[in-house]
Interface confidence: low
């Protein structure tokens, strides 16, 4: 069957839209009237209250839309709505760093139904966004390359559809945990893929299989750059008990949403934080997350590391290839940004059993204490570890070393760090030295060698 609409054209339930393994039911999308796609414009001039706009000359010109700014569309996913706080929060963070037309796309008329139907309704949403982009081009000479479409869950595939319909001329699409069911393993025509925009970046946060783990997001790479924070499956802070999950810092409603789909929602929270942390989400190219956590992917290669989220488009190699995979760790609550350091400690003093910790002090801030090694502490041995600091300390000025004994030792042995090397993710090294040794639980300050 096929159904046609005046502005948006025709929609078929033929393969691959329906009747394939991943979507066996023959279902058509609802009508544009029923999906009721709405465009809610926030700008630097109206950051708190949206202006509802349409693909119409008088509507756009009567609004705060500015043709000399970039336009970022944000498309929500299944069961969600365009007036939900998270979309406006993305806009508000954007206004802190740029002048922009920020358009939240509401399609709750089509998202609040069964999942299979909603997964078809995104075709209408994508067509509406494409129509809007084409209208801006024809009416205002506005280049699609100045358009960025950000889509969460089903919204990521709606963004892909918009990109496909505009022949890949849209500047950028960001997929925030693109939905897995009815999309993973399907032909590119159906789902988000790298041909949908000049640049496609993706954040995967809920990549466990839908059966039996209820992972709503895709594990499949679908962009030029695909980021797998914390491995892309289980996000830190999402394994809280039910009560603390629901009574969330952001309120009962956000807590309830988190309880239902915490990993899946993390993607847009990471993106929101990334806007105001331009270097706090460095993604490391690596064979797998296991290899990354084994400390084998540090520092960034000579071409640098891309930043997950808002600043991914600054990466020089962003479109060198498709399916480039990157790994990183984040925090367990906002602010989710982290700065990774490698610390190598050369020991001095007595041989004891214990563990050593180091804290970093720089021109931008100071870190907590991070454990570098646990076991037998031998003089002249060197131990290395990588950790993710919740503070960007900047250029290192000094480090502090402390050690703890694992057993009671009446001889009160002294241990020191003759040299500590700190390496940042861009490969910058700072060397610190001290001739001193200290008893356990006493801080030792090391200064530049």
């Amino acid at each position: 069957k096929e159904v046609c609409y005046e502005r948006l054209g025709c929609f078929s339930d033929d393969s691959p839209w329906s009747g394939i393994t991943e979507r066996p039911l023959h279902i058509l999308p609802w009508s544009p009237k029923d999906v009721n796609t709405r465009f809610l414009l926030y700008t630097n001039e109206n950051p708190n209250n949206f202006q509802e706009v349409a693909a119409d000359s008088s509507s756009i010109s009567g609004s705060n839309f500015k043709t000399n700014r970039k336009t970022r569309f944000i498309i929500h996913g299944f069961i969600d709505k365009g007036e939900e706080n998270w979309l406006a929060n993305v806009c508000k963070n954007l206004f802190k760093v740029e002048s922009v037309n920020c358009i939240c796309v509401d399609w709750k008329g089509g998202s609040r139904t069964g999942y299979t139907q909603a997964s078809q309704n995104i075709r209408i949403v994508g067509a509406e966004v494409a129509y809007f982009v084409e209208f801006l081009q024809s009416a205002f000479g506005y280049s699609p390359s100045n358009v960025h479409v950000i889509g969460h869950s089903l919204g990521a595939h709606a963004a892909g559809e918009a990109g496909r319909r505009t022949n890949g001329t849209i500047g950028r699409i960001t997929g925030l945990d693109p939905a897995e069911p009815c999309f993973q393993g399907t032909p590119e025509l159906v789902r988000l893929d790298p041909s949908d925009a000049k640049f496609v970046d993706v954040i995967h946060t809920d990549g466990a299989p839908i059966v039996p783990n209820l992972g709503f997001g895709m594990s499949q790479v679908v962009g030029h750059l695909d980021f797998f924070p914390n491995g892309g499956v289980e996000m830190p802070g999402c394994k809280k008990n039910i009560l603390s999950q629901i009574v969330d810092i952001d309120g009962i409603w956000e807590g309830t949403r988190d309880f239902a789909a915490c990993n899946h929602l993390r993607s847009y929270k990471y993106y929101t934080d990334s806007i105001v942390n331009p270097d706090g989400f460095a993604g490391f190219p690596c064979a797998s997350y296991n290899v990354f956590t084994a400390n084998k992917c540090f520092p960034c290669p000579s071409g640098g590391c891309p930043q997950m989220g808002h600043y991914a488009d600054r990466y020089p190699g962003k479109t060198n290839d498709v399916g480039q995979k990157f790994y990183l760790d984040t925090g367990d609550a906002s602010n989710f940004a982290r700065w990774r350091y490698k610390v190598s400690v050369t020991l001095s003093g007595k041989k004891v059993t214990g563990h050593i910790l180091v804290s970093l002090f720089g021109n931008k801030g100071n870190s907590k204490q991070y454990e570098i090694f646990k076991g037998t502490l031998k003089p002249d041995s060197t131990h290395s570890n990588e950790f993710d600091s919740d503070v960007d300390v900047g250029d290192l000025q000094m480090v502090k070393f402390i050690w703890y004994n694992n057993v009671i030792n009446p001889t009160l042995p002294r241990v020191g760090a003759s040299k500590i090397i700190v390496e940042t993710n861009v490969g910058k090294q700072f060397n610190f030295c001290s001739p001193e040794t200290v008893r356990e639980e006493v801080l030792l300050t090391l200064t530049p060698c």
Epitope: S57, S58, I60, S61, G62, T67, G141
Partner: nanobody
Framework: QVQLQESGGGLVQAGGSLRLSCAAS????????MGWFRQAPGKQRELVAS???????NYADSLKGRFTISRDNAKNAVYLQMNNLKPEDTAVYYC????????????????WGHGTKVTVSS
């Protein structure tokens, strides 16, 4: 009543140049974007170039470097300098402007000229 009047079209040999002009007249409060579109026989109307009141320009990718759009806000006019013309540039060229008529607060309406024909012979 607002009107757009194009001029400057005609027959030119490949490699030659033409300058199109378009002036808006009538009861005008302000003009937002002005631009040029073209329609070749049997094809859809397509954007050639546009310019905002602040001077920001936008060109069809295929025409960058050969065509230059400019604007005189005081005269409510827009110009298109076309160099190194090719036979595939043959089309009717239309002026387009987004105009707020006098007494119309902030509503903007899209106005079109009647078109001027450009023929490039090989």
């Amino acid at each position: 009543q607002v009107q757009l009047q194009e001029s400057g079209g005609g027959l030119v040999q490949a490699g030659g140049s033409l300058r199109l002009s378009c002036a808006a007249s009538g009861s005008i409060s302000s003009i937002n974007v002005m631009g040029w579109f073209r329609q070749a026989p049997g094809k859809q109307r397509e954007l050639v170039a546009s310019i905002t009141s602040g001077g920001s320009t936008n060109y069809a990718d295929s025409l960058k470097g050969r065509f230059t759009i400019s604007r005189d806000n005081a005269k409510n006019a827009v110009y298109l300098q076309m160099n190194n013309l090719k036979p595939e540039d043959t089309a009717v060229y239309y002026c387009n402007a987004h105009i707020t008529p006098a007494g119309s607060s902030n509503y903007v309406y899209g106005y079109w000229g009647h078109g001027t024909k450009v023929t490039v012979s090989s």
